[in-house]
């Protein structure tokens, strides 16, 4: 495959509501007009697909309705948001970018973003 550089932050801390956002940036070698972005989770040497979306440049990034991911694109950057995260979801989240059209096909895989998720402490019962 023709290789492409993909950059993403090394570490991100999820919010108390279990939401983590990070930017995935790719160095497009040509006039990329259709891009596929896949988020992979690596934990205990297991790699699983979290979500994926294909978008045309200038169009919105659309994940499946039941996806835990949302995102927006701007030029060669994709702003990804993963929601519904819990402490057990802590792991390395890898951004994979494929330039689907026009040919030739390019593939780039980032080094991953370590997302730390801390479950919020349960609120103590209040006496009223």
């Amino acid at each position: 495959c023709k290789a492409m550089h993909v950059a993403q932050p090394a570490v991100v801390l999820a919010s108390s509501r279990g939401i983590a956002s990070f930017v995935c940036e790719y160095a497009s070698p040509g006039k990329a007009t259709e891009v596929r972005v896949t988020v992979l989770r690596q934990a205990d040497s297991q790699v699983t697909e979290v979500c994926a979306a294909t978008y045309m440049m200038g169009n919105e990034l659309t994940f499946l309705d039941d996806s835990i991911c949302t995102g927006t694109s701007s030029g060669n950057q994709v702003n990804l948001t993963i929601q519904g995260l819990r402490a057990m979801d802590t792991g390395l989240y890898i951004c994979k970018v494929e330039l689907m059209y026009p040919p030739p096909y390019y593939l780039g895989i980032g080094n991953g973003t370590q997302i730390y998720v801390i479950d919020p402490e349960p609120c103590p019962d209040s006496d009223f």
């Epitope: 495959c1 294909t54 440049m57 200038g58 169009n59 689907m100 040919p103 030739p104």
Partner: antibody, heavy 120, light 112 residues
């Protein structure tokens, strides 16, 4: 159903320009690339270029670079190809075609074609 | 540019009999991602081209299963198991491994 309807036949003199339209219906216009293909009389198919309706970004066959201009008007779901500095060997049927990502970017729907005749 | 070469130029066929068309590319169309960027189109008399096969061997929606396609990285074959009268026309192979997209010269299939 998906339809690509092209403008009618044109007769032009050498050196002139021609602008062909391709009106799409039956699908969301901005979800698919539009390609343009040339077919000279009794000849095969030759790719001219493509356009992304979202941002007007184009890819072109170098053979036509500088003479073929691809544009879109998303408000009326229409793609255009303008060919300038016409020569006799531009006499051909020109097709627009939609690309489909599920078919790995094959052209799944084609217009009926527009015959352009270049003659003095 | 990738050159696509088809043979034969013309193919007289008998209805009910099998037929095959060859296509050769000047460069392997098998990408390291496992996809073969080879397509077949049919242009029936007086009509626009229509998609038959994508990714070398996959039938487009509505294409009868009497059509099949196979090949290596550079040599491809389109087969019709039993030719029907409606199959007449010019068959084109095409590639979109790289720009510019290119087509073969076409094979004209006609009834004997």
């Amino acid at each position: 159903q998906v339809q690509l309807v092209q403008s009618g036949a044109e007769v032009k003199k050498p050196g002139a320009s021609v602008k062909i339209s391709c009106k799409a219906s039956g699908y969301k216009f901005t979800d698919h690339f539009i390609n343009w293909v040339k077919q000279a009389p009794g000849q095969g198919l030759e790719w001219i270029g493509d356009i992304n309706p979202n941002n007007g970004g184009t890819n072109s066959n170098q053979k036509f670079e500088g003479r073929a201009t691809l544009t879109v008007d998303t408000s009326i779901s229409t793609a255009y190809m303008e060919l300038s500095r016409l020569r006799s060997d531009d006499t051909a049927v020109y097709y627009c075609a939609r690309l489909r990502r599920e078919y790995f970017y094959a052209m799944d729907y084609w217009g009926q074609g527009t015959l352009v005749t270049v003659s003095s | 540019d990738i050159v696509m070469t088809q043979s034969p130029l013309s193919l007289p066929v008998t209805p009910g009999e099998p037929a095959s068309i060859s296509c050769r590319s000047s460069k392997s169309l098998l990408h390291s991602n496992g996809i073969t960027y080879l397509y077949w189109y049919l242009q029936k008399p007086g009509q626009s081209p229509q998609l038959l096969i994508y990714q070398m061997s996959n039938l487009a929606s509505g294409v009868p299963d009497r059509f099949s396609s196979s090949g290596s990285g550079t040599d491809f074959t389109l087969k019709i198991s039993r030719v029907e009268a409606e199959d007449v026309g010019v068959y084109y192979c095409a590639q979109n491994l790289e720009l510019p997209l290119t087509f073969g010269g076409g094979t004209k299939v006609e009834i004997k």
